[in-house]
């Protein structure tokens, strides 16, 4: 899982992914549900080696969170070829893996 710390790094990560699915976890250190789902998110990055997993701390990277219109945490966004192809909010393990499977 790659930690994103700037808007430039975020754009570069999307560009570098090519045709691969990119999953972005928008979270915060003070967010309980974010902490709860983090180990599962990391396990998915091992299970789905053909998917790019990114993490954005909304406090450290407010410009990315703002550009992606993140309103609550955790929010998971899904990108393909630089385009957003899916999004949902909440620490929902089942929906997270289901969405990856549908979009991969």
């Amino acid at each position: 899982v790659k930690q994103i710390e700037s808007k430039t790094a975020f754009q570069e990560a999307l560009d570098a992914a090519g045709d691969k699915l990119v999953v972005v976890d928008f979270s915060a250190t003070w967010c309980g549900p974010c902490k709860m789902i983090k180990p599962f998110y990391h396990s998915l990055s091992e299970k789905y080696s053909n998917v790019i997993f990114l993490e954005v701390d909304v406090d450290d990277c407010q410009d990315v969170a703002s550009e992606c219109e993140v309103k609550c945490m955790p929010t998971f966004q899904f990108f393909k070829k630089g385009q957003k192809v899916g999004e949902f909010s909440g620490a929902n393990k089942e929906k997270l893996e289901a969405t990856i499977n549908e979009l991969v």
């Epitope: 299970k47 929902n92 089942e94 289901a98 499977n101 979009l103």
Partner: antibody
């Protein structure tokens, strides 16, 4: 405890429509995708499609596009499957299912639909 | 859309015998799922993530495979294992195999 309770058996005439229901208990349907699966007599399982009840987003196997319509009512925690222009090919047991990725997943008891004049 | 081909369609085994059934996918998939179904009942999750046993599944069952080739094995057949087994993949459009009916000899 998670349970999926499906509506009762249906005997319908060719050309008619039927709407099956699947009421969930023990979890909120907004939290996952609800799937529908068809099983014709003595045959295998066929995935019809699924709904994301949180936003109404649906996806169908192309084979069932136009035949099946999946909806959900989050206030009653219920998913629905409507089948239109019924023929004998639609005679089957229809299951709603919570197809999870973990050790457990959950299926309704099935609803038998018989199309006969 | 990924097509899953199961073989054999029907097989029979004596108690104590080793049983292997296969499932071939038309394209590469990440993980295979297996269901057991007995007449008049809903399918039951049997194996998930290719090789993990669902809760309550006896240790004599195992799953393996990768890419396009997967299998379910019973090390020693027991009478209660007689059922139909379906493989299932969870890509963008989920699909099931046609099933392998396992009968007791």
């Amino acid at each position: 405890e998670v349970q999926l309770q499906q509506s009762g058996a249906e005997l319908v005439k060719p050309g008619a429509s039927v709407k099956l229901s699947c009421t969930a208990s023990g979890f909120n349907i907004k939290d996952t995708f609800m799937h529908w699966v068809k099983q014709r007599p003595e045959q295998g399982l066929e995935w019809i499609g699924r709904i994301d009840p949180a936003n109404g987003n649906t996806k169908y196997d192309p084979k069932f596009q136009g035949k099946a319509t999946i909806t959900a009512d989050t206030s009653s925690n219920t998913a629905y499957l409507q089948l239109s222009s019924l023929t004998s090919e639609d005679t089957a047991v229809y299951y709603c299912a919570l197809l999870q990725y973990s050790a457990m997943d959950y299926w309704g008891q099935g609803t038998s639909v018989t199309v006969s004049s | 859309q990924i097509v899953l081909t199961q073989s054999p369609a029907i097989m029979s085994a004596s108690p104590g015998e080793k049983v292997t059934m296969t499932c071939s996918a038309s394209s590469r998939i990440s993980y295979m799922y297996w269901y057991q179904q007995k007449p008049g009942t809903s399918p039951k999750r049997w194996i998930y993530d290719t090789s993990k046993l669902a809760s309550g599944v006896p240790a004599r069952f195992s799953g393996s495979g990768s890419g396009t080739s997967y299998s379910l094995t019973i090390s020693t057949m027991e009478a209660e294992d007689a059922a139909t087994y379906y493989c299932h993949q969870r890509s963008s459009y989920p699909t099931f195999g046609a099933g392998t009916k396992l009968e007791l000899k």
